[in-house]
Interface confidence: low
């Protein structure tokens, strides 16, 4: 079991990013870029939990690109990278980079949609709807059933988005989606519909089928 010996202060961690995105549909070509804070000689890419070997790139600059062609769902997972310099001695690598979660899927998991403080509100009161997925950095859209275009659209750094509904037009049935913020777009399943009603008005069910 070989453990890297690089102290944190000496060999700072590199940064690992994905292009065009870390969430993609199958068949897309993905480039993982490992960027070192200093010029490096060799970069290595690792995937957690697989016996597959590391990917190596010999370069003499600050970054290395690892090409994953026509990715499959199996190539999704947790990746990290390290770098080394020729004068570090055998087996001495940098600290690991940030962990990059690559998700390869045709459809993102269904978000939840909940009302805060609850789905029954006083007439004229505002209500906040939280659409929550599991992946940060997505674009969220809130729909009212029967209306074709989104009511609201939020780019969120969190794995959720809070939509504020103002006053008298609140009652109705709502659902939400989320998707990757840039192409190639990957869309989530639709949330379960959520009925919002005024106190004392009964639960008007505006729900329509899928």
């Amino acid at each position: 079991d070989f453990t890297p010996t690089a102290p944190l202060a000496s060999y700072p961690q590199p940064w690992l990013g994905a292009h065009p995105a870390a969430v993609v549909t199958p068949g897309i070509n993905v480039t993982l870029t490992c960027r070192a804070p200093q010029s490096a000689w060799r970069f290595a890419l690792f995937k957690s939990g697989l016996v597959t070997p590391l990917l190596l790139r010999d370069v003499s600059v600050e970054l290395a690109e690892f090409f994953l062609e026509e990715v499959t769902p199996a190539q999704g997972g947790s990746y990290h990278c390290r770098y080394r310099k020729t004068d570090w001695g055998p087996g001495v690598w940098s600290q690991p980079s940030n962990v990059l979660e690559l998700l390869v899927t045709d459809q993102l998991p269904r978000p939840s949609l909940v009302a805060l403080p609850g789905p029954v509100v006083a007439p004229g009161a505002n209500v906040s709807l939280r659409c929550a997925g599991r992946i940060p950095g997505m674009s969220f859209a809130l729909y009212r059933v029967g209306v074709a275009t989104p009511l609201q659209y939020i780019d969120s750094v969190q794995p959720w988005a809070d939509f504020l509904l103002i006053g008298t037009h609140t009652p109705g049935t709502y659902c939400c989606y989320y998707h990757t913020p840039s192409a190639p777009y990957v869309l989530s399943q639709r949330s379960q519909p959520l009925v919002i009603s005024f106190e004392g008005s009964g639960s008007l069910d505006y729900t329509q089928g899928n």
């Epitope: 070989f2 016996v51 597959t52 590391l54």
Partner: antibody, heavy 117, light 109 residues
């Protein structure tokens, strides 16, 4: 020139132990995933164990507990410690270097292990 | 018994095209890469194809690999007498490397 040279094979009695070595030359040993593959007489190839650059070694189910893979990066050498040997462990043992994206691109010539009383 | 299934034997005459199949499952071939090896009698295996369809330098373009779903195949065109050997497919799952049982290729005539 890239070369792998296995050694340590030979005749051993059932229940005995043996340590195989694989000396590598021609590239940076510490940068690669190394593995042992065996081939019983007249049979196919069977993966035994692998040693990644970072993290724990991994083993085929049949060998977990009996065999131990290790590496000495300063000596450019891979090892396989084999304990509680059985007649069915008789095989040629190859060491191989793993390439990208999951193949064995360089093989040694193999060393024969015979387990017999 | 191997997790990856190959026919035990195949044959062809010089100049012919021969295909060797390798069948697995979604946990190995279906979601991972396939490699092919040639083993001449009394020698170590030699890498023929990696990453489903790539040839290492020095391997003639008579050898080609492909993958579809949970199966892969090795094609040898313009068969020659020196192609007589054992051929193995190889893939992996989340915890181990896997080999097919091997196919003995005989070049007739």
């Amino acid at each position: 020139e890239v070369q792998l040279l296995e050694s340590g094979g030979g005749l051993v009695q059932p229940g005995g132990s043996l340590r195989l070595s694989c000396a590598a030359s021609g590239f940076t040993f510490s940068d690669y995933y190394w593995t042992w593959v065996r081939q019983a007489p007249g049979k196919g190839l069977e993966w035994v164990s692998g040693s990644p650059v970072f993290g724990a070694a991994n083993y085929a189910q049949n060998f977990q507990g009996r065999f131990t893979i290790s590496r000495d990066n300063s000596k450019n050498t891979l090892y396989l410690q084999m304990n509680s040997l059985r007649a069915e462990d008789t095989a040629v043992y190859y060491c191989a270097k793993a390439g990208i994206p999951g193949h064995f691109d360089i093989w040694g010539q193999g060393t024969l292990v015979t387990v017999s009383s | 018994q191997s997790v990856l299934t190959q026919p035990p034997s195949a044959s062809g005459t010089p100049g012919q095209r021969v295909t060797i199949s390798c069948s697995g499952s979604s946990s190995n071939i279906g979601n991972n890469y396939v490699s092919w090896y040639q083993q001449l009698p009394g020698t170590a295996p030699k890498l023929l194809i990696y990453g489903n369809s790539n040839r290492p330098s020095g391997v003639p373009n008579r050898f080609s690999g492909s993958k579809s779903g949970t199966s892969a195949s090795l094609a040898i065109s313009g068969l020659r007498s020196e192609d007589e050997a054992d051929y193995y497919c190889q893939s992996y799952d989340s915890s181990s490397w896997l080999f097919g049982g091997g196919t003995k290729l005989t070049v007739l005539g």
